[in-house]
């Protein structure tokens, strides 16, 4: 046949569904590659055309609209499966065309098994939910298109392995389940089961989110700067490795960017002729406000490097701060006689080089430690 | 009643291709499926491929994948089948037949075009 | 893809007689099976598609059974023009696939 935009495998859209549950998958050309909608399409005279590859096959085969009791069918642009079989996992294509006009795009199509606690390598979406923050709720997902709104289907939710009734503050709602109040216990994952008839059969949806608890936008703060601050002092002989750790407290905020940088003399460590070399840590914790840790590090630092600005920076979408280190150049300690007072200079010493190190590693006493080079 | 007409004998040489015709008439053409099937001399039957013209898309047994070509012109109602690199044993009978969909039973079938590959 | 066997490769039977030919699918093909005739210098032609039901124009002698992976082509009583190659094709499983055949003679 003539010639095709193939918009290649679209594994961006990498679709899992349970077997033995219903399925609708839209053909996704008109969704995110083109810009007009199938009934624009089908009235202009396309034809949308759907095939596949199975799971380690490389041969393109039509798919099966004969099968018993319309396993699979199509409608307008999205292909059914009722229900979905295992070996129905492999890619996808929807073909748009006629003898002017032709474009497609593949898309994988996993059909996944789950066990009796809904457990499945499912990718799960997660839900957050404020600490202590008054009633939320969250909505099964992806039901929406499976029957119409005349039929009423049964739900019921599940956290874990066990029924939602009776729980303190968690109550089923129909399509909803509300937290009266959310605490860190109730982090878990939550499964609803859609129970709904079609065509004297019964068929089930089972769609399973994750819950986090996280920080209450009432308590979020702008970003703290813990380290650098006005009590360390970073003294350094040239010639010796500069540490100074940059570490600040975010409060979680929903679809903030939590942001760290350095800036030496007012600009990025990138655009200064130096050899600088800047570690990031990040950690969380249960509510998900986060630490992070930038360590700037000048292997062999010089007299001018000594005189110049280093300031932290950060930022969220609770505000900007910054803060300056104090760097200074070591003034080398009088030689002393063995009979003279070297004894508390030496003493001295070891505390002021202490007290540098242990602020270095400021970020260091944090868990979970992601290092990005 | 339908009928499937297939153009004629072809001798070619190995590494040609050779490009065999099948018009149909007496029924709708456009959804419904064309299969190729093959027979070599004393053989039994090979299945090699299909399309259905109203949807332009070809479907291939593995066996022939990137060495047939099967297209389908509405207007006209034919479908073509282009076997490529020939060798001596593409030598066979070649069928064109029709059914109601890609899963489906062959129910009318062309009276078969030979296609012999010599030197 | 699909294995489709038949037997035997050969029936040697008298005019008058009944005829069996048996048809093994490697793995199941519902009752997506047909069974096709052959004379020497033809086209095939179909006699039974869905495993059980004649084409139209096939006479009552023929008759097909079976399901899943066991299938059988009966001829009650067989005629001269009988006498031919008969071919199952699964089309449950894309590609489609036939059996390799089995030539009924006069005995």
């Known amino acids: 046949s003539e010639r095709c935009d193939d918009w290649g495998l679209d594994t961006m859209r990498q679709i899992q569904v349970f077997e033995d549950e219903p399925a609708r998958i839209k053909c996704p050309l008109f969704e995110h590659f083109l810009k007009f909608n199938y009934s624009t399409a089908h009235s202009a005279g396309l034809t949308l055309i759907w095939y596949w590859t199975r799971q380690d096959r490389d041969l393109e085969e039509p798919i099966n609209f004969r099968l018993p009791e319309n396993r699979i069918s199509k409608e307008k642009d999205v292909l059914w499966f009722r229900p979905t079989l295992l070996n129905d996992t492999g890619n996808y294509t929807c073909m748009l065309r006629n003898t002017t006009y032709c474009s497609k795009v593949a898309f994988p199509l996993e059909v996944v098994q789950k066990d009796s606690c809904f457990n499945s390598p499912m990718k799960l979406p997660v839900h957050k939910l404020y600490i202590e923050y008054g009633i939320q709720r969250i909505t099964c997902p992806n039901v929406d298109g499976y029957f119409p709104s005349s039929v009423k289907p049964t739900i019921t939710w599940y956290m874990g392995c066990y029924k939602i009734q009776n729980f303190n503050n968690v109550i089923p709602e129909g399509m909803n389940l509300s937290f009266l109040i959310a605490f860190i216990s109730n982090n878990g994952n939550y499964t609803c089961v859609v129970t709904y008839p079609e065509n004297g059969r019964t068929f089930h949806l089972t769609r399973t989110l994750t819950v986090k608890v996280v920080g209450s936008p009432k308590n979020a703060v702008p970003p703290v700067i813990h380290s650098p601050n006005d009590h360390v002092v970073y003294e350094k002989e040239p010639g010796e490795e500069l540490l100074i750790p940059c570490t600040v407290y975010f409060s979680f905020l929903m679809d903030s960017r939590n942001e760290v940088w350095w800036t030496i003399d007012g600009k990025k460590p990138d655009d200064i002729p130096i050899d600088v070399t800047i570690n990031e840590s990040i950690s969380h914790s249960r509510t998900e406000d986060e630490t992070r840790t930038q360590i700037l590090s000048i292997k062999k630092v010089t007299s001018e490097d000594l005189k110049r600005s280093y300031v932290c920076h950060a930022r969220s979408a609770k505000g900007e701060v910054a803060k300056a280190a104090t760097v200074k150049q070591k003034v080398p300690a009088p030689r002393y006689t063995v009979e003279g007072g070297g004894g508390t200079g030496g003493l001295n010493d070891i505390f002021e080089a202490q007290k540098i190190e242990w602020h270095e590693g400021g970020g260091h006493h944090h868990h979970h430690h992601h290092h990005h080079h | 009643q339908v009928q499937l007409v297939q153009s004629g004998a072809e001798v070619k040489k190995p590494g040609s291709s050779v490009k065999v015709s099948c018009k149909a008439s007496?029924?709708?053409?456009?959804?419904?499926?064309i299969s190729w099937v093959r027979q070599a001399p004393g053989q039994g039957l090979e299945w090699m491929g299909g399309?259905?013209?109203?949807?332009?898309?070809?479907f291939y047994a593995q066996k022939f994948q990137g060495r047939v070509t099967i297209t389908a012109d509405e207007s006209t109602s034919t479908a073509y089948m282009e076997l490529s690199s020939l060798r001596s044993e593409d030598t066979a009978v070649y069928y064109c037949?029709?059914?109601?969909?890609?899963?489906?039973?062959?129910?009318?079938w062309g009276q078969g075009t030979l296609v012999t590959v010599s030197s | 893809e699909i294995v489709m066997t038949q037997s035997p490769a050969t029936l040697s039977v008298s005019p008058g007689e009944r005829a069996t030919l048996s048809c093994r699918a490697s793995?199941?093909?519902?009752?997506?099976l047909a069974w096709y005739q052959q004379k020497p210098g033809q086209a095939p032609r179909l006699l039974i598609y869905?495993?059980?039901t004649r084409a139209t124009g096939i006479p009552a002698r023929f008759s097909g059974s079976g399901s899943g992976t066991e299938f059988t082509l009966t001829i009650s009583s067989l005629q001269s023009e009988d006498f031919a190659v008969y071919y199952c094709?699964?089309?449950?499983?894309?590609?489609?696939?036939f059996g390799q055949g089995t030539k009924v003679e006069i005995k």
């Open positions: 037949a029709r059914s109601s969909s890609y899963y489906s039973w062959l129910d009318y």
């Open positions: 007496g029924g709708p053409f456009s959804q419904h499926a």
């Open positions: 399309i259905i013209p109203f949807e332009g898309v070809a």
């Open positions: 793995q199941s093909v519902s009752s997506n």
């Open positions: 869905g495993a059980s």
């Open positions: 094709q699964q089309y449950n499983n894309w590609p489609w696939t």
